[in-house]
């Protein structure tokens, strides 16, 4: 057959759908690979062809669009399952072609089972809510295009296994779920079940997302350096190991990049010749505030090293701060037999 631009298997779009539920899957060619949409392609005489490879098989085969009740159908650039079955799992390919042009892409589709409490291997989107904010809403995701606007579906919301009814600060409002003055106890998995009629049949769409309550921007502060500080002096003799921790607290800030680094005499450790190692650890509070610790280590410190300036720096979207460590050379205690005896004029 003639050459076809093959975009390969697009694993970035690992599509997961629930068993026994409707699924509408758009051909990724028009969304991510080509510069024109389906309407343009169709009016230019291009045809969209679908085929698939079953799970654990190598053979590509056409999709059967003649199943009872049109269980699988195609509409424009969308492949429809009404509903899915477990053995629909596989790699699906959409190909756009005419006599002179061809382009195709494959993508994996996984049909997933869920239990009565909506637990499943499905990867869940995470929605972050700010702690103590007034009203915040989550919306039942990925339900557009399943039914016309004239159809009024019923929507039921669940937290974990429990239907949300008379929850004090969580209020179902159709496709939205409102949280009033969110607390950490609102963390969890929330599921909306959308039920709608179509051609005398009833379909259910199940969508679960994880809510994570995080620190609020109104409480956010610039980075706070807890160590080094003015109370601790790193006093060492040459040959000893010098360990200086830089411990920094960062308020949670959406999409903020938190950075911690050391400078030695104003230079990054990589840019100087002394044998220095830096180890970093990160911990998070329940509201995703972050504490970063970078420990600067010089195995065998020299008297020159003890004269250098060691500064811990930190930066977030809220600002930049720096703090110098107090490093000094330990004055050796006098050895009585030599130094003191000399002081008394002994020979």
């Amino acid at each position: 057959s003639e050459r076809c631009d093959d975009w390969g298997l697009d694993t970035m779009r690992q599509i997961q759908v629930f068993e026994d539920e409707p699924a509408r899957i758009k051909c990724p060619l028009f969304e991510h690979f080509l510069k024109f949409n389906y309407s343009t392609a169709h009016s230019a005489g291009l045809t969209l062809i679908w085929y698939w490879t079953r799970q654990d098989r190598d053979l590509e085969e056409p999709i059967n669009f003649r199943l009872p009740e049109n269980r699988i159908s195609k509409e424009k650039d969308v492949l429809w399952f009404r509903p899915t079955l477990l053995n629909d799992t596989g790699n699906y390919t959409c190909m756009l072609r005419n006599t002179t042009y061809c382009s195709k892409v494959a993508f994996p589709l996984e049909v997933v089972q869920k239990d009565s409490c909506f637990n499943s291997p499905m990867k869940l989107p995470v929605h972050k809510l700010y702690i103590e904010y007034g009203i915040q809403r989550i919306t039942c995701p990925n339900v557009d295009g399943y039914f016309p606007s004239s159809v009024k579906p019923t929507i039921t919301w669940y937290m974990g296994c429990y239907k949300i009814q008379n929850f004090n600060n969580v209020i179902p409002e159709g496709m939205n779920l409102s949280f009033l003055i969110a607390l950490i106890s609102n963390n969890g998995n929330y599921t909306c079940v959308v039920t709608y009629p179509e051609n005398g049949r009833t379909f259910h769409l199940t969508r679960t997302l994880t809510v994570k309550v995080v620190g609020s921007p109104k409480n956010a502060v610039p980075p706070v350096i807890h160590s080094p500080n003015d109370h601790v002096v790193y006093e060492k003799e040459p040959g000893e190991e010098l360990l200086i921790p830089c411990t920094v607290y960062f308020s949670f800030l959406m999409d903020s990049r938190n950075e911690v680094w050391w400078t030695i005499d104003g230079k990054k450790p990589d840019d100087i010749t002394i044998d220095v190692t830096i180890n970093e650890s990160i911990s998070h509070s329940r509201t995703e505030d972050e504490t970063r610790t970078q420990i600067l280590s010089i195995k065998k410190v020299t008297s020159e090293d003890l004269k250098r300036s060691y500064v811990c720096h930190a930066r977030s979207a809220k600002g930049e701060v720096a703090k110098a460590a107090k490093v000094k050379q330990k004055v050796p205690a006098p050895r009585y037999t030599v130094e003191l005896a000399c002081g008394f004029g002994a020979t």
């Epitope: 103590e132 009033l180 003055i181």
Partner: antibody, heavy 118, light 107 residues
Framework: EVQLLESGGGLVQPGGSLRLSCAAS????????AGWVRQAPGKGLEWVSA????????LYADSVKGRFTISRDNSKNTLYLQMNSLRAEDTAVYYC???????????WGQGTLVTVSS | EIVMTQSPATLSVSPGERATLSCRAS??????LAWYQQKPGQAPRLLIY???TRATGIPARFSGSGSGTEFTLTISSLQSEDFAVYYC?????????FGQGTKVEIK
């Protein structure tokens, strides 16, 4: 110094209304969530209502839901509690308090007495 | 709602002695528990938050412990000014709820 000063309490007949105010100073009121807690004579503490820092989110105890309304005016550093359809069992000292999720009710006013009696 | 139960209702202790107050939640409140002190005619005062962290200005003789459903407030050596009513309160879930109080009186 943090101060919360309630006012507006008094004697009211059953079915009547009263509006309590709480003037805040000594902290950034507009960044603070706040609420009302009451204490009936000789009894324990009961949470009544809470409001988010921006005034959008409001919550109520079941015992007052539909009758009481909490609000705030951040430009005046003032918290309010509008109490309608008052009942004898609403008789209590009403305290306003600042709350933060991390520290609960960390600052309290001195309280204002509401007496509902015919 | 979460029910908070305090025990004992009254605790008679001599000055200088140790006092141990208990608070139980009907379901887990994690470490989101506060203790308040209230003297007659006064507003409550925050003593402990986060189950074990002393609020600003609270003497070291007050300490809190516990997590989940069982909590304790300990006053290591009672001073005359410590005789009062003590309330626990959970702030894990709305509605926030208080215990019924423990009165610490002079023996």
């Amino acid at each position: 110094e943090v101060q919360l000063l309630e006012s507006g309490g008094g004697l009211v007949q059953p079915g009547g209304s009263l509006r309590l105010s709480c003037a805040a100073s000594g902290f950034t009121f507009e960044h603070s969530s706040a609420g009302w807690v009451r204490q009936a004579p000789g009894k324990g503490l009961e949470w009544v209502s809470a409001i988010s820092y921006d005034g959008e989110g409001t919550l109520y105890a079941d015992s007052v839901k539909g009758r009481f309304t909490i609000s705030r005016d951040n430009s005046k550093n003032t918290l309010y509690l509008q109490m309608n359809s008052l009942r004898a069992e609403d008789t209590a000292v009403y305290y306003c308090a600042r709350f933060r999720y991390y520290t609960a009710f960390d600052y309290w006013g001195q309280g204002t007495l509401v007496t509902v009696s015919s | 709602e979460i029910v908070m139960t305090q025990s004992p209702a009254t605790l008679s202790v001599s000055p200088g002695e140790r006092a141990t107050l208990s608070c139980r939640a009907s379901q887990s409140v994690s470490s989101n528990l506060a203790w308040y002190q209230q003297k007659p005619g006064q507003a409550p005062r925050l003593l402990i938050y986060g189950a074990s962290t002393r609020a600003t200005g609270i003497p070291a003789r007050f300490s809190g412990s516990g997590s989940g459903t069982e909590f304790t407030l300990t006053i290591s050596s009672l001073q005359s000014e410590d005789f009062a009513v003590y309330y626990c309160q959970q702030y894990n879930n709305w509605p926030w709820t208080f215990g019924q109080g423990t009165k610490v009186e002079i023996k």
